[in-house]
């Protein structure tokens, strides 16, 4: 686990002609905020695809009003970092989308209006624990300057935040098979191993040796469904292992609901729907007035000024029952994707995903990479039913086991010479050409076809392609 951090340094007009109009005006003051979306691997997915690694939204920046006649300056920015926590390993290669949003603060009906001002995207390699990386991206006439890094949250360490460090138990050395944790030499690696036999489907651990159960499962290894332990199922006592399958009396037999309440069976017991003026598990409580506060979950009580007159609860959205005591079955809308099991926990919906899927709504397909490893620091990228390895620089092949020659494909255009380099390749361009791949002709007057050469690079200089 760890955190990706993004620091926005400036957002304003880029160099060159055609400065953009200020997004705010005296009539329509506005303020900026930013959204970052991260995806693992070097995916070129649509902007709308899920932010599988996470997303974050900045605070709103200061209110800005354009000064009439003045050019658009760098716009005032929100304070602080954008932080995207990630629960699992840091993938090393990632795609990002950074959006600049404008919040207009005029007198709109229905509150402020939001509009997307600029969107930049890129693909990068980044090791967790490294220094801040600086970047400049252009979107139309706008320019965004920012820095980013990924850092591990203790006890995780390493370039992927997959190694765990614990304080040493003995002062001199780590246990068998465990190495010291660089740079924390006074700590030792601790592999995260759940308790032996812990159910991989229904159990998980956050500390080595533990086995914590997902909702609906119990037992030391999370292998026992909750319903079989107490067996209040509609159909009588449990057979040895398969749950409540033996036919028996239903829980509504003989109608346990008093005072005219109607009984309905539930998976584990029964439920009474009570007439007005009565509540309780079996509609046994009566003589209630609004002064007794009979409406639950924020329901509004009307009438019922004395015990002889019935009260009515007007329930807020999402609740029902004569006392607003029942939550509407939100799972019936089937929000979980890919066959996930929906659980309504009251404060939130949870999806228990089938093997091979993950995410809050089981929207991420992990199947293609399950049990497959990419060698030499490669990252597995799923898609289309077949796994693919995004290989570290210098390696190639299906599983990144082959040494790659970055110059083999002759990437340098117009007679440029290619040199293999530890971080990729370098093109030394022939006279008259420039660019990372020597793809841009230099015009006779010295201007290039590029919108702007990167700072510090002259036409004809070797350029490293990252």
């Amino acid at each position: 686990a760890g955190v990706f951090e993004l620091q926005i340094h400036s957002f304003g007009p880029g160099p060159g002609p055609g400065a953009p109009r200020s997004p705010c005006s005296a009539r329509l003051p506005c303020r900026l905020f930013f959204r970052v979306c991260l995806k693992p691997g070097l995916s070129e997915e649509a902007a709308e695809s899920p932010c599988a690694l996470g997303a974050a939204l900045s605070a709103r920046g200061p209110v800005y009003t354009e000064q009439p006649g003045a050019p658009a300056p760098d716009l005032p920015l929100p304070d602080g970092l954008l932080q995207v926590p990630f629960r699992d390993a840091w993938p090393g290669t990632f795609s990002f989308i950074i959006e600049t949003w404008r919040e207009e603060l005029g007198d709109q009906i229905g509150g402020p209006a939001w509009s997307l001002l600029a969107r930049v995207a890129g693909r990068r390699r980044l090791a967790a624990g490294g220094p801040w990386a600086r970047d400049i991206q252009r979107a139309g006439a706008w320019e965004l300057r920012f820095s980013y890094r990924a850092r591990c949250e203790p006890p995780a360490v390493g370039t992927a935040c997959t190694r765990l460090c614990r304080p040493r138990s003995a002062p001199s050395r780590c246990g068998p098979g465990l190495r010291p944790c660089a740079p924390l030499e006074d700590e030792c690696e601790a592999p995260l191993v759940c308790r032996a036999g812990c159910s991989p489907e229904h159990g998980f651990c956050e500390q080595p040796g533990e086995c914590r159960c997902l909702e609906g499962w119990t037992g030391p290894l999370c292998t026992v469904p909750v319903s079989t332990s107490s067996c209040l199922s509609p159909r009588g006592p449990s057979s040895a292992t398969t749950g409540c399958l033996v036919p028996g009396p239903g829980p509504c037999d003989g109608n346990p609901c008093a005072n005219g309440g109607s009984c309905s069976e539930t998976p584990r017991s029964f439920e009474c729907t009570c007439p007005r003026g009565f509540y309780g598990l079996r509609c046994e409580v009566s003589g209630v007035t609004c002064a007794d506060g009979p409406c639950f979950n924020g329901g509004l009580c009307v009438g019922g000024a004395d015990p002889d007159s019935a009260y009515i609860c007007h329930c807020p959205p999402g609740f029902q029952g004569s006392n607003c005591e029942k939550r509407v079955d939100r799972c019936s809308l089937q929000p979980c994707r890919n066959g996930g099991l929906c659980l309504d926990l009251g404060h939130a919906l949870r999806c228990r995903c089938r093997a091979g899927f993950a995410g809050p709504r089981c929207e991420h397909d992990l199947d293609d990479c399950a049990g497959r490893a990419c060698a030499n620091g490669g990252t597995c990228v799923e898609g289309g039913g077949a796994h693919r390895c995004s290989c570290a620089l210098g390696f190639g092949g299906r599983d990144c086991r082959e040494r790659a020659d970055p110059c083999a494909a002759r990437p340098c255009a117009h007679g440029g010479r290619c040199y293999a380099h530890f971080s990729g390749l370098v093109c030394a361009c022939a006279p008259g050409y420039m660019g990372a791949r020597c793809e841009f002709p230099v015009h006779p007057d010295g201007a290039s076809a590029l919108p702007a050469a990167p700072p510090g690079l002259r036409p004809g200089d070797p350029q490293r392609y990252l």
Partner: nanobody
Framework: EVQLVESGGGEVQPGGSLRLSCAAS????????MGWYRQAPGKQRELVAG???????IYAESVKGRFTISRDNAKNTVYLQMSSLRAEDTAVYYC??????????????WGQGTLVTVKP
């Protein structure tokens, strides 16, 4: 904050038609699932029709063949075309949506409801 605003309710005779609309607005990144529930007096709220998280359409048995759900993704709006209406369709119809916010969290939202009355 996210708002769901329903419209199109009213009184209609048996066999008549109505079209309900529900527009979602606010700080929405994407809509995962969206649909219509209804609650008749003294009854539990039940799902009428919806688009699931997997974008399938689902209908309650009692409305199949009579009601049609559709949507306009660009407007974050869902519609319920109700025809061959019966007295038992009388209820408050609520729009519901499972929404992904910009924070990447999902939240479930309800509209305030629109009343549909079917009577001769």
């Amino acid at each position: 904050e996210v708002q769901l605003v329903e419209s199109g309710g009213g009184e209609v005779q048996p066999g008549g038609s109505l079209r309900l609309s529900c527009a979602a607005s606010g700080f929405i990144f994407s809509i995962n699932a969206m649909g219509w529930y209804r609650q008749a007096p003294g009854k539990q709220r039940e799902l009428v029709a919806g688009f699931t998280g997997d974008t399938n359409t689902i209908y309650a048995e009692s409305v199949k063949g009579r009601f049609t759900i559709s949507r306009d993704n660009a407007k974050n709006t869902v519609y319920l075309q109700m025809s061959s209406l019966r007295a038992e369709d009388t209820a408050v119809y609520y729009c519901a949506a499972d929404v992904q916010l910009f924070s990447r969290d999902y939240e479930f939202y309800w509209g305030q409801g629109t009343l549909v009355t079917v009577k001769p």
